[in-house]
């Protein structure tokens, strides 16, 4: 039995499609293709003759349409006009002419979408973000993507206004990336050029750890005092020390060379943060032994958490 | 007190290159980054990169990648800045400078400058 | 890059003026914003970083403000030593950049 095969089925706009006749009967001398469901003279696209391989234009002809001598027609550079049915009439030998339709779907093109953001810096725990993809599509599927995987399922994440909005409630650090937004229809997609979502974040509660000399944290008079201080922030913090109260360096590591009982105290590390307008900071005491005795670092630290 | 003391003016003629040289003293040399500005004649300020002392980790402003190295030796806090291919318009006074603190700071103390001059 | 741009570029007061200076940035700068005074053949000399933070010995007749892109160096009452170019300059992460300058003088 005679059929036509469009390939492809969905066609975007711009693009070709191909008409393929499938079971052609052995005494067939001609074709003709219609646009439509059924043989009308107005609706006549082109006419062959297989003996000339001759081919002639009819009143539906628009100039895209190329026939081939195995009955297939090629239309090329589709508007969104060109969608519906196709009747391949191939005319016998015998004179008992046989038909088949076909059909397509034109889709238009998409354009390559864009993302807006209502905030690129977002602070964490406190601001949620809105990415908006553009432009609006009817009969379009929209889709997100995060850091090139497809979007997390997490209730802070929601999507709204048929997926062309994505909110991200009380952004998390984690959040943090590359957004892209797709759109797709039957015969196309297209994905925007990613986004990089910055949250800004912390500073968190710092830590203090000793460093080389001594390990085991034991400070025995005459001994290095080599403190650092680390706390996890974007961007990095700004860090402060002050020994008993009195302002020190702005470093992150805290040296003091040969270290006697005056030593004895409160060491405390500020970092702030002036992104997120947030600071911490942690206190430790500090005990010298003059003797062989080594009370080191006090084990209860204490920190301070500022907003 | 802290003391940022730079080598002597330097003539260098076009396709050369120069090396100058930053001693600290008077802080512990491998707490604060080092940075590198320069000033042309009349001209403002320019941020040229920076050495981190304590790693040697290196960031170079874009217009300088490829012609400048910055280096330090740890044993005498010298820092060094080699800048390559020079052409007319590298002729200006270079300042290194110490990071007010780490991370986000700006610079609080200046070398004295050291004018190079390139000139055929 | 970020872009410091700072107006105005010269300026000409006289003693006891009040002086305004202004600094934009090309981004969000989150107050990391440094202000330098440059005398004629002399280093620059750091005198107000986090925006507003004074350095310690600078006169207290300067003061910083501003904030997200905008910044103002505000000289309350001039003085004939104050006479020099000021530069702002963003402090957050690298590459720095610093405004073109402005070169204040006494009428």
């Known amino acids: 039995k005679l059929t036509i095969e469009s390939t492809p089925f969905n066609v975007a706009e711009g693009k070709e499609v191909l008409l393929l006749a499938h079971n052609l009967p052995q005494n067939r001398i001609g074709y003709s293709w219609y646009k439509g469901e059924r043989v009308d003279g107005n609706s006549l696209i082109v006419g062959y003759v297989i003996g000339t391989q001759q081919a002639t234009p009819g009143p539906a002809y628009s100039g895209r349409e190329t026939i081939y001598p195995n009955a297939s027609l090629l239309i090329q550079n589709v508007t969104q006009n060109d969608t519906g049915f196709y009747t391949l009439q191939v005319i016998k030998s015998d004179l008992v002419n046989e038909e088949a339709t076909g059909q397509f779907h034109v889709y238009p093109e998409l354009p390559k979408p864009s993302i807006s953001s209502n905030n690129s810096n977002p602070v964490e725990d406190k601001d949620a973000v809105a990415f908006t993809c553009e432009p609006e599509v009817q009969n379009t599927t929209y889709l997100w993507w995060v850091n090139g995987q497809s979007l997390p399922v997490s209730p802070r994440l929601q999507l709204s206004n048929g997926n062309m909005t994505l909110t991200l409630l009380s952004v998390k650090r984690n959040d943090a990336g590359s957004y892209e937004c797709e759109i797709q229809n039957p015969a196309s997609a297209n994905r925007s050029d990613p986004v990089t979502l910055n949250v800004l974040y912390g500073p968190d509660v710092p830590t203090i750890s000793p460093i080389i000399s001594p390990p085991d944290s034991s400070y025995l008079s005459g001994a290095n005092l080599n403190l650092s201080c680390h706390s996890a922030s974007n961007p990095s913090p700004q860090y402060s020390w002050r020994i008993n109260g009195i302002p020190q360096q702005h470093t992150q590591v805290l040296f003091i060379a040969k270290i006697t009982p005056n030593n004895n105290g409160t060491y405390a590390c500020f970092v702030s943060n002036l992104a997120t307008g947030r600071n911490n900071s942690i206190v430790k005491s500090i005990t010298v032994s003059a003797s062989g005795t080594s009370p080191g670092l006090s084990a209860g630290a204490h920190h301070h958490h500022h907003h | 007190q802290v003391q940022l003391v730079q080598s002597g003016a330097e003539v260098k003629k076009p396709g050369a290159s120069v090396k100058v040289s930053c001693k600290a003293s008077?802080?512990?040399?491998?707490?604060?980054?080092l940075h590198w500005v320069r000033q042309a004649p009349g001209q403002g300020l320019e941020w040229i990169g920076y050495?981190?002392?304590?790693?040697?980790?290196?960031s170079y402003a874009q217009k300088f990648q490829g012609r400048v190295t910055m280096t330090r030796d740890t044993s005498t806090s010298t820092v060094y800045m080699e800048l390559s291919s020079l052409r007319s318009e590298d002729t200006a006074v270079y300042y290194c400078?110490?990071?007010?603190?780490?991370?986000?700071?700006?610079?609080?103390?200046w070398g004295q400058g050291t004018l190079v001059t390139v000139s055929s | 890059d970020i872009q410091m741009t700072q107006s105005p570029s010269s300026l000409s007061a006289s003693v006891g003026d009040r002086v305004t200076i202004t600094c934009r940035a090309s981004?969000?700068?989150?107050?990391?914003l440094a202000w330098y005074q440059q005398k004629p053949g002399k280093v620059p000399k750091l005198l107000i970083y986090n925006y507003k933070n004074l350095v310690e010995g600078v006169p207290s007749r300067f003061s910083g403000s501003g904030s997200g892109t905008d910044f103002t160096l505000t000289i309350s009452s001039l003085q004939p030593e104050d006479v020099a170019t000021y530069y702002c300059?963003?402090?957050?992460?690298?590459?720095?950049?610093f405004g073109q300058g402005t070169k204040v003088e006494i009428k």
């Open positions: 981004e969000n700068q989150y107050g990391y």
């Open positions: 300059q963003h402090h957050l992460g690298t590459p720095y950049t």
């Open positions: 400078a110490r990071e007010y603190g780490n991370y986000n700071y700006p610079l609080d103390y």
């Open positions: 008077g802080y512990i040399f491998t707490s604060y980054w």
């Open positions: 050495i981190n002392p304590q790693t040697g980790y290196t």
